[in-house]
């Protein structure tokens, strides 16, 4: 990998341990939300998420424990939220979300999501 | 040697419930999704039901959902399927089969890998 | 869902022929595809793994081929224990789909 290749595997996992701890934390202190249908704020294992609209795409920051966080830094990952309240799964039942904006090799250009 | 065995087959009559139960031994079964899988007799096979890790992801084919369950006891290494309200379609033998996946934290996608060892089976008879 | 389809349903075949069976997805799967031997009585076993990969253990005379919608299993030379039934199941979305199989019988 190009630019990530002098950060170790081992220390990524590090940050992505430290960024689902504060995620976690962050999910049990934010305040509800004032609605009764909402998705549910999560760590899908990617990114932090807060509640979200059914039928909306929420957005957050690309994760700061990515390699080249410092490339992406200003981009988002989004997830939809379903018209029931349920974020939307992938084809095998999985979170779901699209993180093209995210990837190292991005250069400011859209790719399709996971298939 | 990695197993799977299942149990708790039998002839039911339609209407009636059934659970069925596959214990897992020779690998890290909180590790792996857990599937089951049927044989009508004379038949192909059908995929039934999935279940990863803790159960927050289960899915079920269209012909069993709101009748069947599957749920799993990490702590006991088995896997079970509560079947309800049994029709005579039901009839099958029912096998559990194991699944790896892997998450790549780096793109945020999961790979599957296919079903890679089954039990023996267990038969299911609906019958009046 | 995504329908597999799955040929011949039968094929006759002499012991040493070479034999082929194809499987259809109806919309892509990438590789994300398993070949199953099934002998009756007993659980399938599985062949190939991601569509092209032997699985431990299984003889090399079997072979996987293909990749997003049209997938191959080839028996180089069938051996007298093959003569049982083959299954594809792809493993790409929920549910998990199966082929109709295929039972490969001795001419």
């Known amino acids: 990998r190009p630019q990530g290749a002098t950060v170790s595997l081992w220390e990524t996992v590090q940050k992505w341990r430290e960024y689902r701890r504060q995620c976690q934390r962050s999910l049990t202190e934010d305040p509800p939300p004032a609605t009764d249908l909402f998705c549910n704020r999560t760590f899908d294992e990617y990114a932090c998420w807060p509640d979200g609209e059914p039928g909306s795409f929420v957005n957050v920051s690309c994760p700061w424990y990515l390699p080249w966080h410092h490339k992406v830094q200003h981009r988002f990952v989004f997830k939809r939220c379903g018209p029931d309240g349920q974020w939307v799964r992938g084809p095998r039942g999985q979170p779901w979300r699209d993180a093209s904006e995210c990837e190292e090799s991005k250069r400011g250009e859209r790719s399709s999501p996971e298939e | 040697q990695v197993q799977l065995v299942e149990s708790g087959g039998g002839v039911v009559q339609p209407g009636r419930s059934l659970r069925l139960s596959c214990a897992a031994s020779g690998f890290t079964f909180s590790s792996y999704g857990m599937h089951w899988v049927r044989q009508a007799p004379g038949k192909g096979l059908e995929w039934v039901a999935v279940?990863?890790?803790?159960?927050?992801?289960?899915d079920y084919v269209d012909s069993v959902k709101g009748r069947f369950t599957i749920s799993r006891d990490n702590s006991k290494n088995t896997l079970y399927l509560q079947m309800n309200r049994l029709r005579a379609e039901d009839t099958a033998v029912y096998y559990c089969?194991?699944?790896?996946?892997?998450?790549?934290?780096?793109?945020?996608?999961?790979?599957?890998?296919?079903?890679?060892?089954w039990g023996q089976g267990t038969t299911v008879t609906v019958s009046s | 869902d995504i329908q597999m389809t799955q040929s011949p349903s039968s094929l006759s075949a002499s012991v040493g022929d070479r034999v082929t069976i194809t499987c259809r997805a109806s919309q892509g799967i990438r590789n994300d595809l398993g070949w199953y031997q099934q002998k009756p009585g007993k659980a399938p076993k599985r062949l190939i793994y991601?569509?092209?990969s032997l699985q431990s253990g299984v003889p090399s005379r079997f072979s996987g081929s293909g990749s997003g919608t049209e997938f191959t299993l080839t028996i180089s030379s069938v051996q007298p224990e093959d003569f049982v039934t083959y299954y594809c199941?792809?493993?790409?979305?929920?549910?998990?789909?199966f082929g109709g199989g295929t039972k490969v019988e001795i001419k």
């Open positions: 089969a194991r699944e790896k996946d892997h998450y790549d934290i780096l793109t945020g996608y999961n790979y599957y890998y296919g079903l890679d060892v």
């Open positions: 199941l792809q493993h790409n979305s929920n549910p998990l789909t």
């Open positions: 991601a569509a092209s």
């Open positions: 279940m990863w890790y803790d159960g927050s992801n289960k």
